[in-house]
Every structure is written in C-alpha cells, then in structure tokens.
Interface confidence: low
C-alpha cells in the first residue's frame, strides 16, 4: 500500500527580523535540507515518442537513476502495472526479455535504461493519449515507477523529453560530482542550522508512514529543477486502451524467451494512494517509490508479472531471432 510523505512546509521568517538577507539565509537551509533528504532517492524517467514515419508507432524509453542494481523492469500501458495497467514488456538483466503485442522490440540500452518500440497497426495499437509506465525493481532501493504520455499537442516525430535529460548517462564521475555537491550542501546546512540554533526550526509535517508501509515521495517540480523533482501521476488514462488488451500476446524477440504469464487477475493488489496532482505540461512524468523489498533477493510485492524467462549466456541484449526459435 502506498502512502504519501508530506513535503516540508516552509514557514516564512517573522517580518522585520532579518530583512532580505535573513530571509535568504533561512530559506536556503530548507532548500538544502530538501536536497539532502532526496539525495539518495532514486528516480525513474520516461520518454514517450511518436514516430514520424509511422503515426501510430511509439517508442518508449525509460531509465533508472539510482545506485542500486536493477533486478526487473516492467513496462505497462493504460496506467501503472497492478493498477489497471497492462504489461507490455518485462526485462530481466540475467533471464532476458519478454514482450507482448503491440510491443515490437524491447531492449536494454544501457545497464539502467531500456527502450520499447510499439507497432501501430491492428486493434491493439496505442494512441496519442495512452499512458505508459515503467517500473524498476532494484536493490536496495525497492520498486520505483514512472509514467509518461505524449504531450497533448505532440507533432509526429516529437517526444516528451525525458525527465532528467542532463543526467541521462549518470556515469561514476557524475554521480561522485553530484554526491560531492550534496555532501558539501549538507555540511553547509548543518553549519547554518547551528548558527540558527536559537530560532525554532519550522516543523516538518509528519509522514504517514511506517517501516512496513512503503512511501511515495511527492516533490513539486519547477522549471529549473525538473531534472530531479517529479510529480506523481494523478489520473490513469484508459480511454484509449483497446478491448483486446485484457489478453496479452507474446510477440517476437530473442530466441531464448519462454512464456511469461502474470498473476494480474489473481494477486491481491493494495490500494494505491496516488497524489492528486495534475500532469506536468511538458510531458507526464512520475517518480513514485512503490515499496521496498521485504527480503533481500525476493521479488518486491506487486512488481507485476511472474518472470519466467530462459537464462542465456548472451545476455539480454541479444535481440536476434523470432520468439521461441530455440
């Protein structure tokens, strides 16, 4: 079950006490505090693109910005997997890739990003207002999901930009650089807090979470910081879900796949408490912590399909061959 952690409410300083500089020095610690709190928080980005050549063909790209190891990626449409969404593809770093129509090709782009091409013909083809979601199960961060759809006025060939474009390839240097800045910020924050020790700190609203209840963090995005701050997706768009989606179809791919059924119709799903925030105008992106592993090495709850893939020494990037030509 998801519960929402509250964003710290910044209380303005009492007027006349410190003036402009005082206001700035008091706000800065809380900006830094926010950064410190979210410093270790992984993010998921989603990019949805309609191909200019095939108007009903989509490319979905998703990436995970976290330090943990990815154990499973699930791509769904019509909403998050387990909340009305239908699985399009499942990618496992060791056991391979499984996909269903209208997915045409799912593949790993990097160790932490994937892409999925959807074909646009037939009854089960996507349309412009379809919501696509990517869920990354990782250890130790847990399960994180993001959703995206084309902006309302997308021209063919254009795409909703990926959420954190500047850090799409978060290599070690980048991670260390960001970590260094954040570390410095946190130290500076502590210094500032000590200086303001005589003034009572603004109270953080308590989070309705417990160790057993995974949290969903909601951070309001600004134009300047959209790379790091995301808004949980509010409405699940199913208006374009074709009727045929209730039965999914394995569809093309590496020769080492096996059948991949799920328990979507049987497994109990906890109620999802989604933040009621509208979709950002520049494309819909979400970063929602969907829960932590109950035990190391166990599949996180509600990651969707039970993965039944055939291990292959070539790894998940071997995309040649039709399904099942073993």
């Amino acid at each position: 079950m998801r519960t929402e952690a509250q964003v710290p409410a910044l209380q303005p300083p009492e007027p006349g006490l410190e003036g402009a500089m005082g206001h700035r020095t008091l706000v800065l610690p809380w900006v830094l505090l926010t950064l410190c709190v979210t410093a270790g928080t992984p993010e998921v980005w989603v990019q949805v693109r309609m191909e200019a050549t095939e108007l009903s063909s989509f490319t979905i790209r998703c990436g995970f910005l976290g330090s943990g190891s990815i154990s499973l990626v699930t791509v769904s449409w019509g909403g998050p997997n387990g909340a009305g969404g239908t699985t399009l593809a499942v990618l496992h770093p060791e056991r391979g890739i499984r996909q269903w129509a209208p997915a045409r090709q799912a593949r790993w782009e990097t160790q932490s990003s994937i892409s999925l091409i959807l074909e646009g013909s037939g009854a089960s083809s996507p349309c412009a207002n379809t919501t696509f979601c990517c869920k990354f199960a990782s250890f130790p961060e847990g399960s994180w999901e993001a959703c995206g759809s084309l902006p309302p006025s997308s021209d063919p060939g254009l795409s909703a930009p990926p959420t954190p474009a500047p850090i799409l390839r978060a290599d070690l240097a980048g991670i260390l650089g960001v970590s260094g800045v954040l570390l410095f910020g946190c130290v500076y924050l502590l210094h500032l807090l000590r200086r303001h020790k005589h003034r009572p700190a603004p109270r953080l609203q308590p989070s309705r979470t417990s160790p057993q209840a995974p949290r969903a963090r909601a951070w309001a995005p600004s134009q300047a910081s959209q790379a790091a701050l995301h808004v949980p997706y509010a409405t699940i768009n199913t208006s374009c879900r074709p009727a045929t989606l209730d039965t999914a179809h394995p569809h093309g791919g590496p020769s080492w796949w096996a059948s991949l059924p799920t328990h979507a119709a049987h497994r109990p799903q906890g109620p999802a408490a989604w933040a009621s925030t509208p979709i950002p105008a520049r494309g819909s992106f979400v970063s929602v912590e969907n829960g932590l592993y109950a035990q190391a090495g166990e599949r996180p709850p509600h990651t969707g399909p039970g993965l039944t893939l055939f291990p292959d020494p070539r790894g998940p990037r071997a995309m040649e061959g039709p399904l099942g030509v073993r």
């Epitope: 269903w100 999914a248 179809h249 096996a258 059948s259 059924p261 328990h263 979507a264 039944t308």
Partner: antibody
C-alpha cells in the same frame, strides 16, 4: 466448456514419425499457450515445450528440441506435435495442456492424453 | 535446468488425516510454482498456481505455501477422492520441469 481433445492411440515403428493433434474448444484459442507433456509408463511428467497460437512462438525443452516440432492451425483451433526418429524410449502418453498467457502460470486444462507405442 | 525434488516419494495415510508434500527447487523460482493431482489413468488436474492460489472448484482443504526454493502442498482432512499422485511444476525459465511426484495411498 473448455475441452482439449487429443487424437487416438498410435502404434508406430522405430525410426518413424508420429503427429499428435490437440483440438481446443470452449475458449479463445489465441489467448492461451499450448504445452505438451510426456509421461512414460509409471514415471513422472516431462515438459516438452509450448507454442503460442497468437503468433506461433514456441519454446522447447532442449531434450526434445531436435525431435519434436510444435505447430498450430488457428483456423481449426488445433495444436500439433510431431515427433521424429522414434525409439522405444518415446513410448509414452503425451498430453497437451493450456496455459493462460500472463495470468495463471499453470496448466489449467489438460487433454485426455495420447498413447504412443513404439514397437517393431 | 532447474531441479525439482519432491518428498516424500510415497505416502500411506488414512482418510481424515492431514498431509504435507514438499517440493524443493534448485534455485529461487519466486513462487512461480503449480501443483497438480493425477489419478491412475487420468490426466493431471491443477490444484494450486502461483504457489498458493487455488483455482475455482478446488476444495479449500488444499492449500499451497512457500517461497524462494521451498514449497509445500497441504491437504487437510484427507478425503477418499484425494488419493493419487501429486506433482509440482515450476514456471521460472524453460524447461518448466516437474517434480518426481508423490504417490498418496490409502492406509
């Protein structure tokens, strides 16, 4: 009512081939994988492979891959398994069973079985 | 290939007793396991899927449990129609191997 009706018993000579049919009815044929399972007399079950009628995709147990071929005819909602180069080791009852894709992860309906006897 | 070790191989019990059959798997299959019952000369029938889910029509005296590499099938208050052979099968990577079976006989 869901039914998987298999073809009758076969008596074949060593080295020959046999084709077993599995006629599905009572459900949407293309929504389910068809699996094939071997059971030698008094022995456990051995999974041979599956085929997905929607697109003909298939998966095999490596042990049977070179000998068994799985096909489907969606127009007649029938699945086929051909076994080549038969030996006495292939004498067994062969079952077809269905598995709902992305749902059950189990074989929820089985055919009645087809007995194949390989003898000269 | 994933190995499925079922135990015991055979079991002689009386009606009304409770039975536990276990299936040990050579690697973590993340609850992708089914149990079947097969009576002499008949096709197998699904009892449990996803390690612990009962399909419609299966009596509630049957229950499945387990995770990781250890799974079990429990039959409470055994009935005369429950006698037969029980098999586990995994669905985690082909080949979807079966256990060796557990033959349940009337004492």
């Amino acid at each position: 009512e869901v039914q998987l009706q298999q073809s009758g018993p076969e008596l074949v000579k060593p080295g020959a081939s046999v084709r077993i049919t599995c006629k599905a009815s009572g459900y949407t044929f293309t929504d389910y994988n068809i699996h094939w399972v071997k059971q030698s007399h008094g022995k456990s079950l051995e999974w041979i492979g599956y085929i997905y009628p929607y697109n003909g995709g298939s998966g095999y147990n490596q042990k049977f891959k070179s000998q068994a071929t799985l096909t489907v005819d969606t127009s007649s909602t029938t699945a086929y398994m051909e076994i080549r180069s038969l030996t006495s080791e292939d004498s067994a009852v062969y079952y077809c069973a269905r598995e709902e894709v992305r749902r059950d992860e189990a074989l929820d309906f089985w055919g009645q079985g087809t007995s194949v006897t390989v003898s000269s | 290939d994933i190995q499925m070790t079922q135990s015991p191989a055979s079991l002689s019990v009386s009606v009304g007793e409770t039975v536990n059959i276990t299936c040990r798997v050579s690697e973590n299959i993340y609850s992708n396991l089914a149990w079947y019952q097969q009576k002499q000369g008949k096709s197998p029938q699904l009892l449990v899927y996803g390690a612990s889910n009962l399909p419609d029509g299966v009596p509630s005296r049957f229950s499945g449990s387990g995770s990781g590499t250890q799974y079990s099938l429990k039959i409470n208050t055994l009935q005369s129609e429950d006698f037969g052979t029980y098999y586990c099968q995994h669905f985690w990577g082909t080949p979807y191997t079966f256990g060796g079976g557990t033959k349940l006989e009337i004492k």
